[in-house]
Amino acid sequence: VEVQVSEDPVVALVDTDATLRCSFSPEPGFSLAQLNLIWQLTDTKQLVHSFTEGRDQGSAYSNRTALFPDLLVQGNASLRLQRVRVTDEGSYTCFVSIQDFDSAAVSLQVAAPYSKPSMTLEPNKDLRPGNMVTITCSSYQGYPEAEVFWKDGQGVPLTGNVTTSQMANERGLFDVHSVLRVVLGANGTYSCLVRNPVLQQDAHGSVTITGQPLTF
């Protein structure tokens, strides 16, 4: 028996359902009584779901997994993972035993989009050219860790005096806070871009300083 899986990682958004595709080619006369299918976490070998002795043995993984029972006889051994969490990320092994056995691993990459950044300024009044200001760009509830880029009004990257911190919350999602310390010119726009490297999603925020008032 030969097991086939997608070579590319499966990308799933947090709280959505994901299908880990796995297939085999059944011989003529194949019956489900012959099939032994085991899904497990590749690294820890923790059992996720199994079908043995002619029946679905059910989920061994937080009751969020299911097979496609009607498609098994056609060689579809895919696994449905419901309400994906950050902790589900990793490699899953699909093991199929009939007359002989084979296995293959498929990777699950979890992602969550970042919120539109909010911008704060410190100090936020009585600003004069030549003042040192701190601009903070905050974006929330994304995964995996973000890439943060700062630019000025002319699109020139600002790399000096940038401090970025990323903190995971209890669900494993990251809140990003990036701080730019800059000396004000006569007026100017400062923009921050928060990029999710898996989703290739960019979230933009900017602040424009034109004397008074400030625009965000």
Partner: antibody, heavy 118, light 109 residues
Framework: QVQLVQSGAEVKKPGSSVKVSCKAS????????ISWVRQAPGQGLEWMGG????????NYAQKFQGRVTITADESTSTAYMELSSLRSEDTAVYYC???????????WGQGTLVTVSA | EIVLTQSPATLSLSPGERATLSCRAS??????LAWYQQKPGQAPRLLIY???NRATGIPARFSGSGSGTDFTLTISSLEPEDYAVYYC???????????FGPGTKVDIK
């Protein structure tokens, strides 16, 4: 070329344990089932148990359940068979074996003679 | 636990003769049956797997047949190197547990 090299002969006292190793080279260690088979002097072959390294699942013959432990170390491509509470009837040549694909044993180690004697 | 019975216990034949070895299972094993050859002082050698498939490098004079509970290993024309003990081995579907038969010794008549 697949090769299975087993550890050397052992002489053990009754009641003690023995651990035999089987180092595999050639092929992907994790992808094949490894069986342990023993043969007492002048007797037939006896399947003791086996392991599928990729699953980390070991299965044992009823006769040896609770007395044998089979493990596999994927990092060193080595399988181990430990037999405890040895008695004189456990004197035998112990073989490890693995297949080309699936379960059947195309390749065998050279055998390890375990002698249990007071 | 499935029990395998092999017959005859000993088969005495001359070179060139046809050898027919039988293996019977106490319950159906589908086609999960293999045959091994063992010579004195040597490790066993896989001849047939899945009841009827010849293993790599095994001469065409060896053939296997049967399914369910009754299986046969046939050596169409015995060669001097074929004198040995032959074991059948079954595997349960899941979990994969194996048992060997007691063996049939093929010796020179």
């Amino acid at each position: 070329q697949v090769q299975l090299v087993q550890s050397g002969a052992e002489v053990k006292k009754p009641g003690s344990s023995v651990k035999v190793s089987c180092k595999a080279s050639g092929g992907t260690f994790s992808s094949y089932a490894i069986s342990w088979v023993r043969q007492a002097p002048g007797q037939g072959l006896e399947w003791m148990g086996g392991i599928i390294p990729i699953l980390g699942i070991a299965n044992y013959a009823q006769k040896f359940q609770g007395r044998v432990t089979i493990t596999a170390d994927e990092s060193t491509s080595t399988a181990y068979m430990e037999l405890s509470s040895l008695r004189s009837e456990d004197t035998a040549v112990y073989y490890c074996a693995r297949g080309d694909s699936g379960y059947d044993s195309n390749y065998w180690g050279q055998g390890t003679l375990v002698t249990v004697s007071a | 636990e499935i029990v395998l019975t092999q017959s005859p216990a000993t088969l005495s034949l001359s070179p060139g003769e046809r050898a027919t070895l039988s293996c019977r299972a106490s319950q159906s094993v589908s086609t999960y049956l293999a045959w091994y050859q063992q010579k004195p002082g040597q490790a066993p050698r896989l001849l047939i797997y899945d009841a009827s498939n010849r293993a790599t490098g095994i001469p065409a004079r060896f053939s296997g047949s049967g399914s369910g509970t009754d299986f046969t290993l046939t050596i169409s024309s015995l060669e001097p190197e074929d004198y040995a003990v032959y074991y059948c081995q079954q595997r349960s579907n899941w979990p994969p547990l194996f048992t060997f038969g007691p063996g049939t010794k093929v010796d020179i008549k």
